[in-house]
Interface confidence: medium
């Protein structure tokens, strides 16, 4: 059968806001296979940080990154 694509899930969400100067990009985690919806920020140090998309700082950060590089996010 077709090769299965591995699913990335977030189990622990960061509470503390990450300053924008540290952020490179983000992607949304919406898979029904995951326990919760999340946003994964990639930092300039290539770290992946899971965050809660309902938090204001997360929404603001996504908006900022969208303006910085207006490419559609999955």
């Amino acid at each position: 059968g077709p090769a299965s694509v591995p699913t990335t899930c977030c189990f622990n969400l960061a509470n503390r806001k990450i300053p924008l100067q540290r952020l490179e990009s983000y992607r949304r985690i919406t898979s029904g296979k995951c326990p919760q919806k999340a946003v994964i920020f990639k930092t300039k140090l290539a770290k992946d940080i899971c965050a809660d998309p309902k938090k204001k700082w997360v929404q603001d950060s996504m908006k900022y990154l969208d303006q910085k590089s207006p490419t559609p996010k999955p």
Epitope: N15, R16, K17, P19, L20, R22, L45, D60
Partner: antibody
Amino acid sequence: QVQLVQSGAEVKKPGASVKVSCKVSGYTLTELSMHWVRQAPGKGLEWMGGFDPEDGETIYAQKFQGRVMMTEDTSTDTAFMDLSSLRSEDTAVYYCATDDMLTPHYLYFGMDVWGQGTTVTVSS
Amino acid sequence: DIQMTQSPSSLSASVGDRVTITCRASQGIRNDLGWYQQKPGKAPKRLIYATSSLQSGVPSRFSGSGSGTEFTLTISSLQPEDFATYYCLQHNTYPFTFGPGTKVDIK
């Protein structure tokens, strides 16, 4: 809005330790990155250390490494700064400082809201 | 560590004067710089973040500019409540470091 209230003044003998507390209200401590700054009498501001949200750990200034410990009690939303092996040069006002959580672009490491300061006097 | 220097270390000025304070970093810090005002016996208060953004509630007579290694804080028309000590802070690289301060007093 974030508010920080610090513990009262302390007088300590050389060689002793001091633990300064900083109580957070308006937000939970786990949402904030706390920093500690001190100011000796008539002198400037000196950053001692603070929580780095990317690394998820506390970074200490080299000068205080091994002598300072910054901890949190999330059940009471209180941050602590413990300084050991005190000497007279540690006589200073100690401040906790953090994000206001309102700054529209989170470009900045938070030192927008400050506690009222805790005077620590080290004297024999 | 990044060293921050400020000039002048003190200045005397009159109400209505335009005042400029300079802060220099020993290496490039992009725009990762803030300005603080401190009055005797009080905690510092942030005026400017990210080099040029005005902190909410701070009067528009305060402004910041610069990038890289040289930064300025300008008070366009000094008011009686502005007599204080001003510090810059770099938060580009650990350890964060403050400038030594500039004391602004009445001429």
